[in-house]
Interface confidence: medium
Amino acid sequence: AVLIPQSSVCPNAEANNFLQNVKVNLKVINSLSSKASSRRPSDYLNRSTSPWTLSRNEDPDRYPSVIWEAQCRHQRCVNAEGKLDHHMNSVLIQQEILVLKREPEKCPFTFRVEKMLVGVGCTCVSSIVRHAS
Amino acid sequence: AVLIPQSSVCPNAEANNFLQNVKVNLKVINSLSSKASSRRPSDYLNRSTSPWTLSRNEDPDRYPSVIWEAQCRHQRCVNAEGKLDHHMNSVLIQQEILVLKREPEKCPFTFRVEKMLVGVGCTCVSSIVRHAS
């Protein structure tokens, strides 16, 4: 991948190593701005018809250093009687997230962006598409 | 969480303004290196008992510029007959992601990291906790 040779925005941007050496403001990482509105660890993982567990994935050289990954508790869904319904499957909803990895042995510290696929929660699906009537 | 320890590696890293001007390798973002093992956009949004839609959130100064956010299609869940079940609720599973904002008027391009809470999909929950027997 190389940089646009003729960008009207930044005309003299240097080609090849631009992407490997970009200045980024990481202040968000250190901010303790109020998370009350957004951070609500929910109890959906227990109340769902496709319940899940969370396992801790920790890496001190990564931001965020702790990532909680969902795994579906059962292959099937739980019905109203608390029994497993063999016509319905619990499936993992996955999402890619961007993480920052610290590149050790570099001064001043540099980071690289990585993509990581994580399980977020589970949903209950049928093998056919049904629309509510 | 700060990624800068009191390190003997880079002893003079000054926390606060260091974070505002960090060198980051963004090469992963443009890479189309093989994604086969991880990339499986799902059709769960239609097949789920708590189906969802995706709505477009666009910001040309953000990476990714377009974010498709999940919204639950119904307040209730869809049962095996395709009818809404008034004892079960569709709820949104949310996750924080990191996005990059381009800081305009800066050459070469500079970016800042921001957090964003996005809806990923929906799950069907009961008002009481049930464990599969």
């Epitope: 940089l3 646009i4 631009f18 | 086969a36 499986r40 956009p41 059709d43 990476y63 990714p64």
Partner: antibody, heavy 126, light 107 residues
Framework: EVQLVQSGAEVKKPGESVKISCKAS????????ISWVRQAPGQGLEWMGG????????DYAQKFQGRVTITADESTTTAYMELSGLTSDDTAVYYC???????????????????WGQGTTVTVSS | EIVLTQSPDFQSVTPKEKVTITCRAS??????LHWYQQKPDQSPKLLIK???HSISGVPSRFSGSGSGTDFTLTINGLEAEDAATYYC?????????FGQGTKVDIK
């Protein structure tokens, strides 16, 4: 709805260069990339390279490396593709195609081509 | 580079019939497979993205399936306006590559 309008047909001699423009309207230019795909007479589609406007970076197919240059001008929302050292094998219809920069269905990039220009015919003949 | 092989190369079909076009990748590409329709003297048009995801405005008779190396485009109940060449496209690994195309005409 994004619309891509390309420049008109070109007739060139072997060894010359051609530069085709692709003007985008109806959407934020920075919110997607532009790829260039060509189609020789009676043949299939061949990807030449593409540009990601947000980061200002380009990728080229190995086959065209060194001969193709893809650029963009954000102020006029126009992408360009220049191909040098033309031979008769470069006679083709050249298309620009939009590549979304989406976080869609839980993933950070989408790489389908969801909108295409009308095509520019380039004829190389002595 | 990843090679995509479509079959058949040509298909002549009666209206209302079901059409199936397959696309085989030379290596695993997950779901990174898209389908396009190209009519004579027109630009290609996206029909299906990511193997099975429908596109707004595309008739529901077009559907896609598959993952890994084997993919299928199905037209359920061919209509006269569907006479065209159909291409598969992989975006898993650079360079993007396309199948050789399948021409569908109406009997």
């Amino acid at each position: 709805e994004v619309q891509l309008v390309q420049s008109g047909a070109e007739v060139k001699k072997p060894g010359e260069s051609v530069k085709i423009s692709c003007k985008a309207s109806g959407g934020s230019f920075r919110s997607y990339g532009i790829s260039w795909v060509r189609q020789a007479p009676g043949q299939g589609l061949e990807w030449m390279g593409g540009i990601t406007h947000f980061f200002g970076i380009t990728d080229y197919a190995q086959k065209f490396q060194g001969r193709v240059t893809i650029t963009a001008d954000e102020s006029t929302t126009t992408a360009y593709m220049e191909l040098s050292g033309l031979t008769s094998d470069d006679t083709a219809v050249y298309y620009c195609a939009r590549e979304p920069n989406d976080f869609w269905n839980g993933y950070y990039d989408t790489h389908d081509f969801d909108s295409w220009g009308q095509g520019t015919t380039v004829t190389v003949s002595s | 580079e990843i090679v995509l092989t479509q079959s058949p190369d040509f298909q002549s079909v009666t209206p209302k019939e079901k059409v199936t076009i397959t696309c085989r990748a030379s290596q695993n590409i997950g779901s990174e497979l898209h389908w396009y329709q190209q009519k004579p003297d027109q630009s290609p048009k996206l029909l299906i993205k990511y193997a099975s995801h429908s596109i707004s405005g595309v008739p529901s008779r077009f559907s896609g399936s598959g993952s890994g190396t084997d993919f299928t485009l199905t037209i359920n109940g061919l209509e006269a306006e569907d006479a065209a060449t159909y291409y598969c496209h992989q975006s898993d690994t650079l360079p993007h590559t396309f199948g050789q195309g399948t021409k569908v005409d109406i009997k």
